[in-house]
């Protein structure tokens, strides 16, 4: 995943006993939080890997490329990155892996310059449909976010909500149309059974979609139509059986896209001439020649471009008085 | 930002090849694809075909097929365009240009065919 | 080839005026039509993509329209620093292909 990149060569550590001193007053210029490696020649703060519990308030106000990751954060409440003097040049977050679970109404506020946020590998319970807006405006102001990496953030069955995952977090993501200008979206390793049919056609600016590695059975009912600019849908290590007709044609009008479709249990029926065809004729798909049938039982293995409409045949079914028990 | 630098003037005589260079920066938010555009002098724009930089799927204009070759080093952020059997209407300022709608352009690499 | 032609050539107008440009594409393009400057000894910059679509940091004076064949670009009051070279490209069917240009002036 795209997380922000540091160039950082000479990081300064600041002691630890000077964090509470100043913390309710405007760090100074070159002051490092406690726990963490500052360098303001890279624009970059480093607080990896140290169990904090919350967001530091002292971080310093030129700071670029924050990284978080690896703490024990649990809940990010709203303004958590507001100071005064606002952090204007913050561009890419990563709290990737620290171990929260509720992400609260405008958490992001105050970040004019947030471009790439990474979320990835925390158990997400609750994420605010204002996570991402700020206010629960129909029309809220447009986000900066330009790159959103939410991989991995599914939280253990037990401490899910009673309520779709899959809606929790397409609900952040409509909110107040706050997410126009998203171009990259990486959702992988979701669990996600279903997409919702209406998240993509609100998100007009997608050039990269990451749905890998969940359990997608079907897209009859999504549309790929409104993201004219669409460049790689990753659906890999998916549920997926088949491509139908109305998706192939979608796909095939997107002139700039790259479809990765490897590791999905293809079934090889007469349901799948129309995709067989299509991969035959088609060069947006990715590594094509390597995918193979999962079922039925005597087509495994077979590859999807070696397939005849003679191979792709339906058992037919019989009549209810023919069928034994 | 993306920025997309190219490298040097070339000049070279006719039968011979050129590899252009192009080094994005900003790469962050760029694009996966990077076209190549040439203009001769006082004329207009022709597309000569596109990489698709994770993968490495080309596009070429069917008029250039077999002359060109378009690669791309992901470690380094860099693409190439390279075009061989070089002629005298060969000469032009070549573009590279990031991104599915040619978002962000490069400053240019002018190409000069003489013998 | 999808050809795509550009109309007029060239024009003169005066500060504040309305400018319009006009593309014709040989068959239907779907919308995938981009508008580009460009000043004298520099690269093209895009304006505007798939029809109406202004690119980050572009002026709203600024605008498309247009559908299937037929395609316009207009500035709404033309401003000093807009000298220079306009040029349509489909982006729909490959190979990509532009207009041939029109070259705008003060007059």
């Known amino acids: 995943s795209s997380s922000p990149t540091s160039s950082a060569s000479s990081f300064s550590s600041s002691a630890p006993f000077l964090a509470s001193a100043v913390s309710a007053q405007p760090p100074l210029p070159d002051q490092c939080p406690a726990l963490c490696e500052c360098s303001e020649a890279a624009r970059t703060v480093k607080c990896v890997n140290r169990n904090l519990t919350e967001v530091p308030t002292d971080l310093p106000a030129y700071v670029r490329n924050l990284f978080l990751t690896g703490n024990q954060l649990a809940v990010l409440p709203a303004g958590a990155f507001a100071r005064r003097p606002p952090l204007a040049e913050l561009a890419a977050l990563n709290l990737s892996g620290s171990r929260l679970d509720e992400v609260r109404a405008g958490a992001f506020e105050h970040l004019p310059s947030l471009r790439q946020l990474d979320l990835s590998h925390n158990p997400l319970a609750d994420l605010s449909p204002f996570a991402f807006s700020g206010s629960n405006a129909s029309v809220s102001a447009p986000s900066p976010l330009v790159e959103l990496i939410l991989n991995h953030i599914v939280p253990p069955e037990d401490e899910r909500q009673n309520r779709s995952f899959e809606g929790m977090v397409v609900a952040a993501l409509l909110a107040g149309r706050a997410l126009q200008g998203l171009r990259r979206l990486e959702l992988a390793s979701n669990h996600f059974l279903y997409l919702p049919r209406d998240v993509l056609a609100q998100l007009p600016s997608l050039r990269h979609l990451d749905l890998s590695n969940n359990s997608l059975v079907s897209l009859t009912y999504v549309s790929f139509r409104n993201l004219t600019h669409l460049e790689s849908l990753h659906l890999e290590d998916n549920a997926l059986k088949v491509l139908h007709n109305g998706t192939l044609a979608e796909l095939q009008g997107l002139p700039h896209i790259r479809v990765f479709l490897d590791n999905n249990p293809w079934v090889c029926d007469c349901h799948m001439a129309d995709m067989v065809t299509w991969l035959k004729e088609t060069e947006v798909v990715q590594g094509k020649d390597r995918l193979t049938c999962a079922y039925p039982e005597k087509m495994r293995n077979r590859v999807l471009l070696e397939l005849n409409s003679a191979d792709l045949d339906c058992d037919p079914i019989l009549p209810p008085s023919l069928q034994t028990s | 930002q993306v920025q997309l630098v190219q490298s040097g003037a070339e000049v070279k005589k006719p039968g011979a090849s050129v590899k252009v260079s192009c080094k994005a920066s900003?790469?962050?938010?760029?694009?996966?694809?990077m076209n190549w555009v040439r203009q001769a002098p006082g004329q207009g724009l022709e597309w000569m075909g596109r990489?698709?930089?994770?993968?490495?799927?080309?596009n070429y204009n069917g008029k250039f097929k077999g002359r060109v070759t378009m690669t791309a080093d992901k470690s380094i952020t860099t693409a190439y365009m390279e075009l061989s059997r070089l002629r005298s209407d060969d000469t032009a300022v070549y573009y590279c240009?990031?991104?599915?709608?040619?978002?962000?352009w490069g400053q240019g690499t002018l190409v000069t065919v003489s013998s | 080839d999808i050809q795509m032609t550009q109309s007029p050539s060239s024009l003169s107008a005066s500060v504040g005026d309305r400018v319009t440009i006009t593309c014709r594409a040989s068959?239907?393009?779907?919308?995938?039509l981009n508008w580009y400057q460009q000043k004298p000894g520099k690269a093209p910059k895009l304006l505007i993509y798939?029809?109406?679509r202004l690119h980050s940091g572009v002026p709203s004076r600024f605008s498309g329209s247009g559908s299937g064949t037929d395609y316009t670009f207009t500035i709404s009051s033309l401003q000093p620093e807009d000298i220079a070279t306009y040029f349509c490209?489909?982006?729909?069917?490959?190979?990509?292909?532009f207009g041939g240009g029109t070259k705008v002036e003060i007059k």
């Open positions: 798939y029809t109406s």
């Open positions: 068959q239907d393009i779907s919308n995938y």
């Open positions: 240009a990031n991104g599915g709608a040619m978002d962000y």
């Open positions: 900003g790469y962050a938010f760029s694009s996966s694809w």
């Open positions: 490209a489909n982006d729909n069917t490959l190979p990509w292909t």
């Open positions: 990489i698709y930089r994770e993968d490495g799927h080309t």
